[in-house]
Structure formats: C-alpha cells, structure tokens
C-alpha cells in the first residue's frame, strides 16, 4: 500500500466564486475516496466534479475532485480522503 499525497488548490471562477480542487497522487491501490465537505457534512454528488483515477506512470495512481464555493467561505470547506484504512481532512488554503 502506498498512501496518497493530497494537495488542495484554489482558483478564481466567476465574480464572488472560487473553484477549490483537491488532488491525490502517488497512491496504490486505486480505490480512494476523495470528496468535499461543508461544515463537516458531505456535499451532494451533483455539486462536485471528479477526475478519473488514472495511472501516473510510476505504478501508482492520481485523481482529483473540485467544487465551486463562495469567496470568503473557504474555512467552511474541507477535502476528505479515505484510502486503505486511513483517512485525513484537508482545508482550503487562505
């Protein structure tokens, strides 16, 4: 088992909104849970966009999940990761 590296980034979307993206890379096996939470509660599937889990060429995998949020509310959102019996949460950088 190889645990993922998780990285959260932000980018401007439209006026007053930002897109936050959570990337996991370098993990094995492929089956990983990666999703966004607001105030500790899961966001619905239809408010998130997922990348496919893809091989990264090193025998491990990478994927991402993104969602659009209101600027100024970043502290309410966290990216949640589960992989091979381990879990972690990752905040949006300010």
């Amino acid at each position: 088992t190889v645990p993922p590296m998780v990285n959260v980034t932000r980018s401007e979307a439209s006026e007053g909104n930002i897109t936050v993206t959570c990337r996991a890379s370098g993990f094995y096996p492929w089956n990983i849970t990666l999703s966004w939470r607001q105030d500790g509660v899961s966001l619905s599937h239809d408010t998130q966009q997922w990348g496919d889990v893809l091989p990264d060429g090193n025998g491990t995998y990478q994927t991402w999940v993104a969602t659009r949020i209101c600027q100024g509310e970043e502290q309410r959102f966290t990216c949640y990761m589960e992989h091979s019996g381990n879990h972690s949460t990752h905040p949006v950088p300010s």
């Epitope: 089956n31 990983i32 849970t33 990666l34 999703s35 939470r37 500790g40 509660v41 899961s42 619905s44 599937h45 239809d46 997922w50 990348g51 496919d52 889990v53 994927t63 999940v65 949640y80 589960e82 992989h83 091979s84 019996g85 381990n86 879990h87 972690s88 949460t89």
Partner: antibody
Framework: QVQLKESGPGLVAPSQSLSITCTVS????????VNWVRQPPGKGLEWLGM???????DYNSALKSRLSISKDNSRSQVFLKMNSLQTDDTARYYC??????????????WGAGTTVTVSS | DIQMTQTTSSLSASLGDRVTISCSAS??????LNWYQQKPHGTVKLLIY???SLPSGVPSRFSGSGSGTDYSLTISNLEPEDIASYYC?????????FGGGTKVEIK
Amino acid sequence: QVQLKESGPGLVAPSQSLSITCTVSGFSLNGQGVNWVRQPPGKGLEWLGMIWGDGSTDYNSALKSRLSISKDNSRSQVFLKMNSLQTDDTARYYCARGAHYGKRWYFDVWGAGTTVTVSS
Amino acid sequence: DIQMTQTTSSLSASLGDRVTISCSASQNINNYLNWYQQKPHGTVKLLIYYTSSLPSGVPSRFSGSGSGTDYSLTISNLEPEDIASYYCQQYSKLPPTFGGGTKVEIK
C-alpha cells in the same frame, strides 16, 4: 470476506428509543463508511444515514432530529440510535457498507437486516 | 428530495424472457444511479452501479442503461434465481433515495 450483521431488540414500545448494532468483519471501519437503510413491511427502502471512516456522519434530514450514528472501530461495530419511535418506524433495518470512488457511490455489501416492531 | 419512480410495481415473465424494468427521477441525476436486487427472504445485493457498471460476480445477463431522468435495468434471459424485487437508487443529491421497487415473478 466482507460481512455485516445487525442485532436489535425486536420489539420497542411507542415513544421509546431504538438501539441497533451492526458488527462488521472483513474490512476496517477506520477506512470505509457504513450506511443504515430501513424497509417498512411491504414498502420500499429508505436511507437513514451513514458514518464515514473518520467518524463524521451524514443523516437523512427528515429523520436527523431523532437519529444518532456512532461506532467503535476497535470492536468493529456501528451503532444506530433512534428516539421517539412510533408505529410507522416498524421496519427491517439494514446496515450496508458504502463504497465511494469518485463518481461512483454504492452500497456494495448488506447485512441480512433486523426486524423492529413498534408496538405496546 | 429527489423522487424515484418505478411505475411497474410487479411483472410476470417466463423463464428465458428479456425483462426490462424502468425507473425515472424527478430531476436530472447525471447517471448517478444504482440498482439493487432483494430476494423474497430479504437479502439485498448490489446489481448495477453508476447506471451501467456490473460488480464482479453479477451475471452478464444483467445490464443497465439510461441518462438524465430515465433509466432501465434489463435481464436478458430470465432465470429462476432472478425472482426478486429490484430497486433503483439515486445518489446525485443527499439523501440517496430509492424507487418503490419492481417485483419480478414467473408466469
């Protein structure tokens, strides 16, 4: 081999609370979520809520005020507690493992269920 | 909540028949749909996930299709062990919701 087994009281008096235990084997509660689903006699399935690997919970908002889901990772047990039971809470209660991989979220292994009857 | 409707609550078919079960959502669910089989004694099993993906161990006579609000489950060659109730379930929005079920019986 992944297995889940529910155990409950069978009979609960109206206005009392319900406690059901789901004991799992073949996977770690620290790394996967467990859902609760119920089915009233002759009716369809209703999702009650779930607990994630880190202990966070999501609930069906229609029942949130009466529901509590918790777990004990070391004993491989998940607990459902529901307060203020009425006769329409009579149902078969199932626990099911949740698999959440990107666009895919499904309940891949289910327990056999435990029947709960609310009656005086 | 998103309402899932299975208009046919029960159907009778002969062994070897092709059986199609329909399910409609009250809004677009973007293929976020699963199917479950419940045997008469209550055992529930995942049959199809994400509209058309088959879990390992599920016979290839089962298939799923659809998009938007309309989805279907097809059993291409009905066998005795397929006698069960079938439920669709959306997970586009929380809470996940199930259809009312379609009971398949032998004619």
